[in-house]
């Protein structure tokens, strides 16, 4: 089809070489009701009215893809041909940055219900690079969390090196959706809930003599539970004295709590102290049994294939840690008088 | 550094099978459950299958029932999807997932699988 009456939008993705992160294009045709731009090929492409990502119920959010190759060739079917970007209803998502990704993007309706249809298209223009900027060397990450329950901000991490007074006007995504209150560099969210959670896109204009691009940015941003402040405590064994039977195998069980850390290292380990010695037994691997949003329960057994006098002198110890600290219970074994 | 590193993905006829495998580095345990994600284009991330790691239970999505199959080796830590008589509709990114603090927390790059003629 004829891309030269499609409205033009030039976008600019800036990448940071040290994280991992994706890139949204939204098909960007007006809101039927409040332009008459799909319907009449009326518009030059300068005379676009506001965008909003078409997310509405005339199923305009059923669109097709193209990318227009730069050697003239004709457009090439996204979904076919490039398997690191997904189309999710009307929105593009790059999963990883490259400059690769630098290129022309066309968006239509699938449906063309009329001649007048054929113009409503969009064609993104996009330039990816890597981000140069030394001076900005803590800038925002592009995945963000928040804190259930407390005051927390979602930073535009293309902007967030630049004071809020300094900040041009931003328009904010979340999930797609046009966030209309917000439009500085900055979201406060006064208390955070789970449905703070998701993909937000911050988009603002620079412009030179000759053009203006929209700068765009895209932040996961996850809800959390904050990272406990206990050390672990071990629900079993309880008791330090375990009565058992000569000649018979024993497992014993550890069972510990650990609370939520968001970089989660748990260790928990048997060790056996015999008079002065003491050293770590080789057991089966620890298993989370429970898992909850704010605790995960982690056993690990010992496991003697036959109790012997010896055991009896010896106590068998469990060992857990985490970041803030380690607890220990001992087992002394007890032979079972009959 | 907890990771997970999918392997196995690639093209296929339909009625063909692939077996993808989802290797653990960094765990200090097993978690309670691991899990097979896909995403196609265009469509939410689903789940395909998980395992328990307490008792070795299997859940699977309704469309792969009967032809997909989850399994892990704790001893190489390690977790596998058997995927036979395969159709055009599960051609996806794959993705495999680590339960942690009540959800699947720690996820894979993903691997391709791609069913054509």
């Known amino acids: 089809f004829n891309i030269s009456g499609c409205s033009t939008k030039k976008l600019l993705w800036t990448y940071s070489t040290r994280s991992e992160e994706e890139f949204v294009l939204f098909c960007d045709l007006p809101e039927p009701q409040k332009s008459h731009f799909c319907h009449r090929n009326r518009l030059s492409p300068k005379q676009v009215p506001e965008h909003l990502p078409f997310m509405g119920s005339n199923d305009l959010s059923d669109v097709q893809w193209y990318q227009q190759p730069s050697n003239g060739d004709p457009l090439e079917d996204i979904r076919k041909s490039y398997p690191h970007i997904i189309q999710d209803k009307c929105t593009l998502h790059f999963l990883t940055p490259g400059v690769n990704n630098s290129g022309s993007y066309i968006c239509r309706p699938k449906m063309i219900k009329s001649p007048y249809d054929v113009a409503c298209c969009v064609k993104m223009i996009l330039e990816v690079k890597p981000q140069t900027n030394a001076s900005c060397e803590y800038s925002a990450s592009h995945k963000q969390d928040l804190l259930l329950g407390s005051t927390g901000s979602i930073s535009c991490p293309s902007l967030s090196c630049q004071s809020d007074a300094q900040s041009p006007a931003v328009t904010w995504y979340k999930n797609g959706k046009l966030l209309s209150v917000e439009r500085s560099n900055r979201i406060v969210v006064d208390e955070v809930y789970d449905y703070h959670q998701g993909t937000y896109v911050c988009d603002y204009t620079q412009s030179d003599t000759v053009s203006s691009w929209t700068v765009r940015a895209v932040v996961q941003v996850r809800t959390i539970v904050g990272d406990t402040k206990l050390k672990p405590d071990i629900l079993d064994p309880v008791e330090d004295t375990l009565e058992v039977e000569l000649g018979k195998p024993l497992t014993i069980s550890c069972k510990a709590r650990f609370g939520f850390e968001r970089v989660f290292n748990p260790v928990i380990k048997w060790y056996i102290k015999d008079s002065d010695l003491e050293w770590e037994v080789s057991v089966p691997e620890a298993k989370s049994i429970k898992s909850t949003l704010k605790d995960e329960i982690i056993e690990r057994n010992i496991i003697l294939e036959k109790v012997t006098q010896r055991d009896l002198r010896r106590k068998f110890v469990c060992f857990v840690q985490n970041s803030i600290g380690n607890t220990t219970q001992s087992v002394q074994l007890k032979e079972k008088r009959g | 550094q907890v990771q997970l590193q999918e392997s196995g993905g690639g093209s296929v006829q339909p009625g063909g099978s692939l077996r993808l495998s989802c290797a653990a580095s960094g765990f200090t345990y097993i978690p309670a459950y691991m899990g097979w994600f896909r995403q196609a284009p265009g469509k939410e991330r689903e789940r395909v299958a998980s395992?328990?790691?307490?008792?070795?239970?299997?859940t699977y999505a309704d469309s792969v029932k009967g032809r997909f199959t989850v399994s892990q080796d704790t001893a190489k830590n390690t977790l596998y999807l058997q995927m036979n008589s395969l159709k055009p509709e599960d051609t996806a990114m794959y993705y495999c997932?680590?339960?942690?603090?009540?959800?699947?927390?720690?996820w894979g790059q993903g691997t391709q699988v791609t069913v054509s003629s």
């Open positions: 395992i328990s790691s307490t008792d070795g239970s299997t």
């Open positions: 997932a680590a339960y942690q603090f009540g959800a699947f927390r720690v």
